[in-house]
Each structure stands twice: as C-alpha cells, then as structure tokens.
Interface confidence: low
Amino acid sequence: EVEKTACPSGKKAREIDESLIFYKKWELEACVDAALLATQMDRVNAIPFTYEQLDVLKHKLDELYPQGYPESVIQHLGYLFLKMSPEDIRKWNVTSLETLKALLEVNKGHEMSPQVATLIDRFVKGRGQLDKDTLDTLTAFYPGYLCSLSPEELSSVPPSSIWAVRPQDLDTCDPRQLDVLYPKARLAFQNMNGSEYFVKIQSFLGGAPTEDLKALSQQNVSMDLATFMKLRTDAVLPLTVAEVQKLLGPHVEGLKAEERHRPVRDWILRQRQDDLDTLGLGLQG
C-alpha cells in the first residue's frame, strides 16, 4: 500500500494527461484526485502508464468506491480492467451491453480469464437470461462460448439466438449440450425450406432423435460421414438400412471405412445381413 504523503507544490493534477507518466507512484497517489480520475477514466487508456502506475490508479478508485465501481467508470476502464481481480468484479453491477463489449475488447485475442468469466457472470445474472444480443456478443469474442456452457445454462438460451451460431462454434460441444441445443435450432429454423434447413441444422444433429433422422432421410439431404459419425448412437440404431442409405445418399460408401467405429459399428450389428448386403459394401453384421 502506498504511504500517504503531501503533494509537492505545483504538482496537483488538474486533469488526467500525459504529464502524469513522469510522476512517481507516491506522487500519483498524493496528487491525483480520485474523483477527477473517475470522471476522466476515458483518458487513461491513451496514456502509456506503467503497470506500477496503473496499480496506484486502481488503488485510488478502490478507495473512492469500496462497494464497487459505478458503471460509468467500469465502461471506461480499458486496460485497467486487466488489473481487476474476480473479487473486484463481483462487486459490480454491469447492465449495459456496451460496457461488456468495451471490456471484452480489452481481453480480445487472449484466453478466457477468470476476470472475464466473472464479468460475464455479473452481466448475465443482471439480465436474468442469455438474450440474443448478449449471445451474439459473446460468441463473436469467444467462438467456443456455447460449448463452454453446461446444459443447464444452455437451457436459458432463446431459440432466436441460435441464428448467430456458426458450425465451428459447436466443434467442442458434447452430446448432452447438443441435446439441449438441437430442439432450439429446430424451432429457430422451422420456416426454412428443405435444403436450406439442412445446411443450418446440420451442425446441431448430434442432438437429434431417431424420428427426426427418419424424416431427414426422406428429403435427399446427402448427409456427409463426418456429420453421421457425430449422431447419437441411440438415435441411429433404430434406422433401417434403407433409411441410412437415403440419409447418406452418395456418401453411403463411407460406411465401410467407419465400420469399426461408433455409431456405425453398433448400427451394423443391429441389422440383418441380407439388408446390409443390399448396400454392396461388404459390411458384416
């Protein structure tokens, strides 16, 4: 903690400007008024303060706002945000999406940090749910965001938000997460025509039940093997050979290469050999 010392004559800061970079830590503590700092936070990021100087500025704000910073200050924290601990952030009440964006921008390109995770907690708790604008923002900054949520958290995602999701955003989702997302996607894309619908729903099919796969098999969708291999085993097992052939179209030949892997292996074992032989792939049940 910085010792309380009187500000030298003529050094009292009248505004937050570049001259302050030449102040020693104790001079910043003594000569910069915390209220002035709070009203001119937007200027701090334009000034090349050292990390040690930023520590002093943070200390001044902490003294001024022991219960947590107001949003007017939070929105302009800029690089000072990187100095905040999760404990600091838990005191905040962040409600503006602009504030969230401003702070995510500071952390852009870095891994998700405990600070950012805590910030997102505060924001989503304040809003009561993951609305579309929030989800759009979070997936823009953190593409894998959806797959980082538990199925319980995903249940609060409104179907309208699914439009923002790109296939690569679902790469790390596990089956239980897709179980929650798939019905939302189905609802979101329900008014699209067949081929467009399949393009949109394809990434979510790891959560699809058997009856939906049967329906898709009637629509000449030509599902690729990569998508087929991500389907739920329990959803694939009841499909007939004819239905799988229709579902995969020209990609059906790829079953041979995957015959030892789930769900193909388990599906093959459930079929009659006569039916498998109709595919002409040499699959053995």
Epitope: M112, A117, T118, I120, D121, S148, S150, E152
Partner: nanobody, 124 residues
C-alpha cells in the same frame, strides 16, 4: 431445491489417493456443483478447489495445488475431486457446493447449496 450428495471419502495412508464425487439432484437448471471446501476439527471451513467455464477454468487453494484435480461431467451433473499425495493435514470433512455462474471462485458466499460432507482421514 438442489440436493448434493458427496461420496468417496474414507481412511487412507499418507501419500495415498482418494477420489471424491458429488452428484446434484433436484431443480438443477441454473445451479450446478462446482466447488469443494473442507473443514478440519476445530477449524474454519476453507476453500479447496472450484471449476467453472465449461470445465476449462479451475481454481485451487495453494495448499492443494499440484496434488488435487477438480473436474466435472455434465451428463451426471457431477463434480469430482481427485486427491493424490495425501498428507495428514488434508484430514477433514469435505463439502461440495453448488452455485450459478461460470467463474470458479473461492468465495463461499457465491455458493447457494451445500452437501452434508464426506469424511477424509489421512493417517501417517
């Protein structure tokens, strides 16, 4: 209401290992198990480990870092604590805690539901 049930405690020799698990049941839509605390006889309850952010982000007490590993599975809504290289000073009742949120935290005030605890005894 969320119910938390810990299991896996027991008696183990110093240097040994134990694996604790905590399963959540009840209305778990928003709350899920994400932390372990412990309380030794005559001492305050202390933070051990926490997991958040889809299992990618974890936090540990300094005293257990490198020896304990916290993990989580969605399918069973369960949080685990793998404890290796156990020491006599790890002897305590271990409690599982559930809360909302994606950031791991050592702050017990952030957790809304607690399990009954499971006894871990490490003999020298």
């Amino acid at each position: 209401q969320v119910q938390l049930q810990e299991s896996g405690g027991g008696l183990v020799q110093a240097g040994g290992s134990l694996s604790l698990s905590c399963a959540a049941s009840g209305h778990t839509d928003s709350y899920y198990p994400k932390a372990w605390f412990r309380q030794a006889p005559g001492k305050e309850r202390e933070f051990v480990a926490s997991i958040g952010w889809g299992g990618r982000m974890t936090a540990y007490a300094d005293s257990v870092k490198g020896r304990f590993t916290v993990s989580r599975t969605y399918a069973k809504n369960t949080v685990y604590l793998q404890m290796n290289s156990l020491k006599p000073e790890d002897t305590a009742v271990y409690y599982c805690a559930a809360g909302i949120g994606w950031a791991p935290t050592a702050d017990s005030g952030e957790y809304d539901y607690w399990g009954q605890g499971t006894q871990v005894t490490v003999s020298s």
